[in-house]
């Protein structure tokens, strides 16, 4: 009972975790405008992996995409090959844990497959979650580094006659969400892996026997060994092939070059 | 057709107060920040506040801080600037605007005037 | 606080004739994150409300003459009417509509020979 509690759980914390990581990936606040110590404008810039936008006071909001695949810079590359393989690997997780729940019955499946596809998923949950948090700090940290950068020439003007406001970017909402939801991924998938120990056949050598001894009403049960020869031990390996994943910008009818924060 | 009718101006004395409206037709009131200007006799415009959609955040200039506040109900399409603490420099025609792109006032009205004498 | 300055304070024109008036801020008004400059133009006729004209420095409002055109970036703008007509005799004014108070420029006023 509390092996299958434990998978279910993980497999919820999992799903929660991985739809958080696609929530973080699509949104638009991963940098936005540092409004402390700067110049009150009527205009609020924020930026995601995939397009920047500025928000007026008047209401009106105005994004445009990222065209340039080789323009844009290395760090932001990574971080969007890293969210997606996170996204990849933790849906693919998804579609396996499905299979080794013990709720669910698919056929004579055996509990030593159960256990095996049980680690499968916890592992890639755990490689997702990573994936997630590695991605949100590589950003993070380039947000730092620009944020510090922009601080030591904040204004940079003309004989001090005319000043330029530099904008400076600090962390937005997604970056919480991609380091909530890459630990709750990870947590599930530490989760799947625990209840994969307990999902892994037990077999023992010795049945019980009770022994009777004259004048003695104690019984003594000999075995209790655990025969295990490790997980998944005698199942067959699966290859799990992805796809490849592929991500287009939305077109836009007004290309520009965009200074990424 | 986008309409803007101001009311509520007239005579002030200094110190006394009052209450200007603006009310709104032929456009979505709700979805649109709106400011309000003012333009003393024989002089040039000036910007006095400007108020959100949602009323989240409201802008004065330095000289009516404190003394002026905007206000906005939305189901009723008006706009309103309560003026305290009044003076004499603050005669002048106020006129409502619309933010439209580039937080530009796109449409305004025909203007009240306030005057502020003893 | 952004200080717009316009030049000339008047212009004395005839008809047809080319106008450039200029507007300078303090600041600049160039927004990267979009690539565009938070300024506007307005003309205020005598008795009346002023009526925008130009919003993003050069895109005209629909309903307004081709004959205004905007342009400059950064801190340094012009109004370019090409061929004045009466009916543009006006005084016009720019406007900071990046930092707040989203202040005005004296403004400029076209008067005629």
């Known amino acids: 009972m509390a092996v299958t509690a434990c998978q279910g759980l993980g497999f919820v914390v999992s799903l929660i975790g991985i739809a958080g990581i696609i929530a973080a990936t699509c949104m638009d606040q991963w940098s936005t405008q540092d409004l402390y110590n700067n110049p009150v404008t009527a205009v609020f810039n924020y930026q995601g992996l995939w397009r920047s936008c500025v928000r007026e006071s008047s209401g009106f909001t105005e994004c445009r995409g990222y065209f340039t695949l080789l323009g844009l810079p290395a760090m932001l590359q990574a971080v969007r090959a890293l969210m997606i393989v996170g996204i990849v690997l933790g849906a693919i997780g998804l579609l396996v844990s499905i299979f080794a729940l013990k709720c669910i019955r698919i056929g004579s499946m055996e509990d030593s497959a159960k256990a095996n596809m049980t680690l499968t998923s916890g592992i890639m949950f755990i490689v997702s979650g990573l994936c997630a948090i590695a991605g949100v700090s590589v950003f993070a940290n380039m947000l730092v580094t620009n944020f510090w950068m922009s601080t030591a020439n904040m204004y940079t003007g003309m004989g001090g006659m005319v000043q330029t406001v530099q904008t400076r970017y600090t962390f937005g909402a997604a970056l919480f969400v991609g380091w909530v939801a890459g630990g709750l991924t990870l947590i599930g998938g530490v989760m799947m892996c625990i209840a994969c120990r307990g999902l892994a056949p037990e077999e023992t050598n010795y049945k019980a026997v009770s022994y009777h001894a004259s004048g003695h009403s104690v019984a003594y049960k000999p075995g209790g060994f655990k025969a295990s020869t490790g997980f998944g031990s005698n199942t067959k390996n699966k290859k799990i092939y992805d796809g490849g994943a592929r991500t287009e910008d939305e077109v836009q009818s007004y290309p520009s070059k965009h200074d990424y924060v | 057709d986008v309409q803007l009718v101001e009311s509520g101006g007239g005579l002030v004395q200094p110190g006394g107060s009052r209450r200007l409206s603006c009310a709104a037709s032929?456009?979505?009131?709700?979805?649109?920040?709106m400011y309000w200007v003012r333009q003393a006799p024989e002089k040039g415009l000036e910007w006095v506040a400007f108020i959100t959609s949602d009323s989240t955040s409201i802008y004065y200039v330095d000289t009516v801080k404190g003394r002026f506040t905007v206000s906005r109900d939305n189901p009723k399409n008006t706009l309103f600037l309560q003026m305290t603490s009044l003076r004499s420099e603050d005669t002048a025609m106020y006129y409502c605007?619309?933010?439209?792109?580039?937080?530009?006032?796109?449409?305004w009205g025909q203007g009240t005037s306030v005057t502020v004498s003893s | 606080d952004i200080v717009m300055t316009q030049s000339p304070s008047s212009l004395t024109v005839t008809a047809r004739e080319k106008v450039i008036m200029n507007c300078k801020s303090s600041?600049?008004?160039?927004?990267?994150?979009?690539?565009?400059?938070?300024l506007s133009w307005y003309q205020q006729k005598p008795g009346q409300p002023p009526k925008l004209l130009i919003y993003w420095a050069s895109t005209r409002k629909s309903g307004v003459p081709d004959r205004f055109t905007g342009s400059g970036s950064g801190t340094g703008f012009t109004l370019t009417i090409s061929s004045v007509q009466a009916e543009d005799l006006a005084v016009y004014y720019c406007q900071n509509n990046y930092f707040y108070p989203l202040t005005f420029g004296a403004g400029t006023k076209l008067e005629l020979n």
């Open positions: 605007g619309r933010t439209g792109y580039g937080n530009a006032m796109d449409y």
């Open positions: 032929g456009f979505s009131f709700s979805n649109f920040g």
């Open positions: 600041q600049s008004l160039f927004n990267s994150g979009n690539q565009k400059n938070y």
